[in-house]
Interface confidence: low
């Protein structure tokens, strides 16, 4: 089943997030992703846990998953590079770089997103945008078109409270509020964008969604700048 959902959001403006990617397994949406360079998509390492021998591809330039759109193109994956320290049983280092079979053809609806290199926390309360094609309600309805929601960043101390994530949020992770509006699982790999810059990637650890005491967890890309650069080099 696809990993991910946007809860309490709304349909995104078509093609207004040209960096948005759908990581697909055997032709079906699996996870979100974000185009960070012409030939590279950043996603979450846990997304490929269930991939086994399936065919992994990346869809770019899409708003609707099913409808013909002039900008849509499905790319094969040449190489999948999970972070070397990612492990199945933790949310740490949950990053994956996918090298496309060729450079993406850039256009109005396909364009890399600048990512944060300055390793400094986003100010609590900052409104950030998260988008994805995951299910939109607890009944499991899957959207055909891209959904998004604006979420305020939550400070790490609050997120680490015993009632919340109980110390699991390291300096390499960040949180966003989850009161009825939330990302979940397989929006996993999708971007958390603050001020037009990629700040976080939705983690794919399982957690209850839309519960304010279980904030959304995002991997801070700035904390992994050296690794990203080394892979893209």
């Amino acid at each position: 089943p696809p990993r991910g959902r946007i809860l309490g959001g709304r349909e995104a403006e078509a093609h207004a997030r040209p960096y948005m990617a759908s990581v697909q397994l055997n032709g079906a949406h699996l996870c979100g992703g974000v185009l960070v360079a012409e030939q590279w998509v950043l996603s979450a390492a846990h997304c490929l846990e269930d991939a086994a021998d399936g065919k992994v591809q990346v869809l770019l330039g899409a708003h609707s998953l099913s409808q013909p759109e002039p900008s849509k193109r499905l790319y094969d994956v040449l190489r999948a590079v999970p972070h070397p320290d990612s492990q199945p049983d933790t949310i740490d280092h949950d990053l994956l770089l996918l090298q496309l079979s060729e450079k993406a053809t850039l256009g109005p609806a396909v364009r890399p997103l600048p990512w944060q290199r300055v390793d400094r926390d986003v100010a609590p309360g900052t409104l950030c945008d998260v988008a994805g094609w995951g299910i939109v309600n607890h009944a499991g309805r899957r959207p055909d078109s891209l959904q998004h929601v604006l979420l305020p960043v939550l400070d790490r101390a609050t997120c680490n409270r015993r009632t919340h994530h109980d110390g699991a949020i390291t300096e390499r992770l960040m949180c966003a509020e989850s009161n009825r509006r939330d990302s979940c699982k397989g929006d996993s790999g999708g971007p958390l964008v603050c001020g037009g810059v990629l700040e976080g990637v939705v983690t794919s650890g399982s957690r209850v969604c839309g519960n304010r005491k279980k904030p959304g967890i995002y991997t801070r890309v700035a904390s992994y700048a050296a690794w990203i650069d080394s892979v893209l080099a």
Epitope: E11, A14, Q67, P70, R73, T105, L106, G107, P108, V110
Partner: antibody, heavy 122, light 107 residues
């Protein structure tokens, strides 16, 4: 057979308004992005507006932004261009164009109508 | 805006000849370039997209090449029906922009 038939072109005074229509047939209109492109008397082509298949995404060049509005009625298979605050430099032949769904994607235009003529002059 | 420059407004050729029409982009557009043919009194027709892919039904005497900033449309074994205006277009970013056109005419 794909057909795009424009109408609504006319002689209008500077500052005036005009609404162009494009009747589409021979394909599933709601499945395609559409644009208006104009050709000025020296034959140059200028793209003036784009609409996604459900009109949730529209875009304009600076030359017409705030003056032109593209819209569509998928039930009527019709694309529109509402033009206001018209200037003499808007004088042109206006084409309705379709954006194909190519396996490789892209904002190219695979079908063009025959055009409708707009003249802005006092 | 990305400016597409077609340096030759006119090009003279003879039936059976080979002719190359060039187009230069003001910045890197990858291969997001299309070519259109406009015969006298008609609307433009798509010939080539992604710089080198022929559109359905386009004769193989039309060939596109190039990437980055320099693009070429080559017509080999020119036929009388090829005498027309040719326009390049970039679609790597908004606004979508066209070259000013090159008119292919008989010597």
């Amino acid at each position: 057979e794909v057909q795009l038939v424009e109408s609504g072109g006319d002689l209008v005074k500077p500052g005036g308004s005009l609404k162009l229509s494009c009747a589409a047939s021979g394909f599933t209109f709601s499945g395609y992005g559409m644009s208006w492109v104009r050709q000025i008397p020296d034959k140059r082509l200028e793209w003036v507006a784009i609409s996604s298949r459900d009109n949730s995404f529209t875009y304009y060049p600076d030359s017409v932004k705030g003056r032109f509005t593209i819209s569509r009625d998928n039930a009527k298979n019709t694309l529109y261009l509402q033009m206001s605050s018209l200037k003499s430099e808007d004088t042109a032949l206006y084409f309705c164009t379709r954006h194909p769904y190519l396996p490789t994607g892209g904002y190219v235009m695979d079908y063009w109508g025959q055009g409708t003529s707009v003249t802005v002059s006092s | 805006d990305i400016v597409m420059t077609q340096s030759h407004k006119f090009m003279s050729t003879s039936v059976g000849d080979r002719v190359s029409i060039t187009c230069k982009a003001s910045q890197d557009v990858g291969t997001a370039v299309a070519w259109y043919q406009q015969r006298p009194g008609q609307s433009p027709k798509l010939l080539i997209y992604w710089a080198s892919t022929r559109h359905t039904g386009v004769p193989d005497r039309f060939t596109g090449s190039g990437s980055g900033t320099d693009f070429t449309l080559t017509v080999s074994n020119v036929q009388s029906e090829d005498l027309a205006d040719y326009f390049c277009q970039q679609y790597t970013s908004y606004p979508l922009t066209f070259g000013a056109g090159t008119k292919l005419e008989l010597k």
